[in-house]
Interface confidence: low
């Protein structure tokens, strides 16, 4: 997605992104909570195709691991955390039945505050 | 996705997320910048899938649509903006070729920051 | 309090054709896959079909002394279960229990009280 | 289709009494997929086992699982007057299917 230091922004929380095949995803988690096996490959009208998905995370070696970047620390406590969202992936539940399921994969570094209390 | 509210927290950023369906997206932009129309239904073995995505965007009715929340001012500008994320659909291409390509949908709400120049 | 119901239980001749229902309350009913099982008269339980939640689409499976014959169905709005039974015979009579599926594996933790099918002539 | 025989078919057995009740599988069962219930008359069966020894919920202690393979076991080590009803194992590791219950009833 478009880059914010090519415009002289900052993000408050630096991220890395990655492509992920289902080779090395393995397992994910579904809309309902269950872990569920994600299928290698796809069938498609001319073959196969191998499935895998964009992912966002924050990045663990970046400057904002210790907390978020620009935040006025005398009100506020920050984190920067990975939040998930919901793509559509062939896959296979622990009932060993095949289907199309929206599982959850890394989509973001978001920035989360906790108000300082009163020393 | 997990909930910072629960915890006591609050985001840098207000977003809403919704199902949208392709109906509603009609096009999309593909990893190559063009313009590619999502297909409503999706062949599956035992008929067709409707098409949908899970995005989340920058709320505009939002407390922090004027800048993001918790930011020392001080020292920096800041902006709400809704990033995007690649998602595999099946889509027609201008010459009508249907085929999976990767888009790109909005799926998060992150702050970028300027730095605050001298007075 | 988890609570399933069924009803559309009747006599009927081989041939016909009858519909079950099974109305869900106090649970999420449309993350849950569900089932169907079975009690003949006097004998033990066997599982006739199942359909998948929302996690997936809802995908249907069948025992093989039932499949094409019977059809199983959701309607989240309604929080209702439904069990289409064709071409009925003597040996479908049972008492029809409507089942929640454990999120995991095909297992059962809560039940509804069941409605009686007799295959008659 | 895995076959599920269980023994006795019914156990005669007086209040306070230990009862053992036998789930035998026709193959190996993997992990350990199977569950237990209990039917009393014009009721529905109830939960009380699953993944072989874990105990659903409300479920009091003196119900017991355990075994593996193809040999399992439902323990109730102290027979209350509630539980003198039809209990039935089931597998989950396939299709599912249920063994054809053991009656415990009072002696």
């Known amino acids: 997605h478009s880059d914010p230091a090519r415009r002289g922004e900052l993000s408050v929380c630096d991220s890395i992104s990655e492509w992920v095949t289902a080779a090395d995803k393995k397992t994910a988690v579904d809309m309902s909570g269950g872990t569920v096996t994600v299928l290698e490959k796809v069938p498609v009208s001319k073959g196969q195709l191998k499935q895998y998905f964009y992912e966002t995370k924050c990045n663990p070696m970046g400057y904002t691991k210790e907390g978020c970047r620009g935040i006025d620390k005398r009100h506020w406590n920050s984190q920067c955390r990975t939040t998930q969202s919901y793509v559509r992936a062939l896959t296979m539940d622990s009932k060993k039945r095949i289907g199309w399921r929206f599982i959850r994969i890394d989509t973001s570094c978001v920035c989360t505050l906790t108000i300082k209390r009163g020393r | 996705h997990s909930d910072p509210a629960r915890r006591g927290e609050l985001s840098v950023c207000d977003s809403i997320s919704e199902w949208v369906t392709a109906a509603d997206k009609k096009t999309a932009v593909d990893m190559s910048g063009g313009t590619v129309t999502v297909l409503e239904k999706v062949p599956v073995s035992k008929g067709q899938l409707k098409q949908y995505f899970y995005e989340t965007k920058c709320n505009p009715m939002g407390y922090t649509k004027e800048g993001c929340r918790g930011i020392d001012k001080r020292h920096w500008n800041s902006q709400c903006r809704t990033t995007q994320s690649y998602v595999r659909a099946l889509t027609m291409d201008s010459k009508k070729r249907i085929g999976w390509r990767f888009i790109r949908i909005d799926t998060s709400c992150v702050c970028t920051l300027t730095i605050k120049r001298g007075r | 309090d988890v609570q399933l119901v069924e009803s559309g239980g009747s006599v009927v001749r081989p041939g016909e054709s009858l519909r079950l229902s099974c109305a869900a309350s106090?649970?999420?009913?449309?993350?849950?896959?569900m089932s169907w099982v079975r009690q003949a008269p006097g004998e033990g339980l066997e599982w006739v079909s199942g359909?998948?939640?929302?996690?997936?689409?809802?995908?249907?499976y069948y025992a093989d002394s039932v499949k094409d014959r019977f059809t199983v169905s959701r309607d989240n709005s309604k929080n209702t279960l439904y069990l289409q039974m064709n071409s009925l015979r003597a040996e479908d009579t049972a008492v029809y229990y409507c089942?929640?599926?454990?999120?995991?594996?095909?297992?059962?933790?809560?039940w509804g009280l069941g409605t009686l099918v007799t295959v008659s002539s | 289709e895995i076959v599920l025989t269980q023994s006795p078919g019914t156990l005669g057995l007086s209040p306070g009494e230990r009862a053992t009740l036998s789930c035998r599988a026709s193959?190996?069962?993997?992990?350990?997929?199977l569950a237990w219930y209990q039917q009393k008359p014009g009721q529905a069966p109830r939960l009380l086992i699953y993944d072989t020894s874990t105990r659903a919920a409300g479920i009091p202690a003196r119900f017991s699982g355990s075994g593996s393979g193809t040999e399992f076991t439902l323990t109730i080590s102290s027979l209350q007057s509630e539980d003198f009803a039809v209990y039935y194992c089931?597998?989950?590791?396939?299709?599912?299917?249920f063994g054809g219950g053991t009656k415990v009833e009072i002696k």
């Open positions: 359909i998948r939640g929302s996690g997936g689409d809802a995908v249907t």
């Open positions: 106090g649970f999420t009913f449309s993350i849950y896959d």
């Open positions: 089942a929640k599926e454990n999120n995991r594996r095909i297992f059962f933790d809560y």
């Open positions: 193959r190996s069962i993997g992990r350990t997929y």
């Open positions: 089931q597998q989950y590791d396939d299709w599912p299917s």
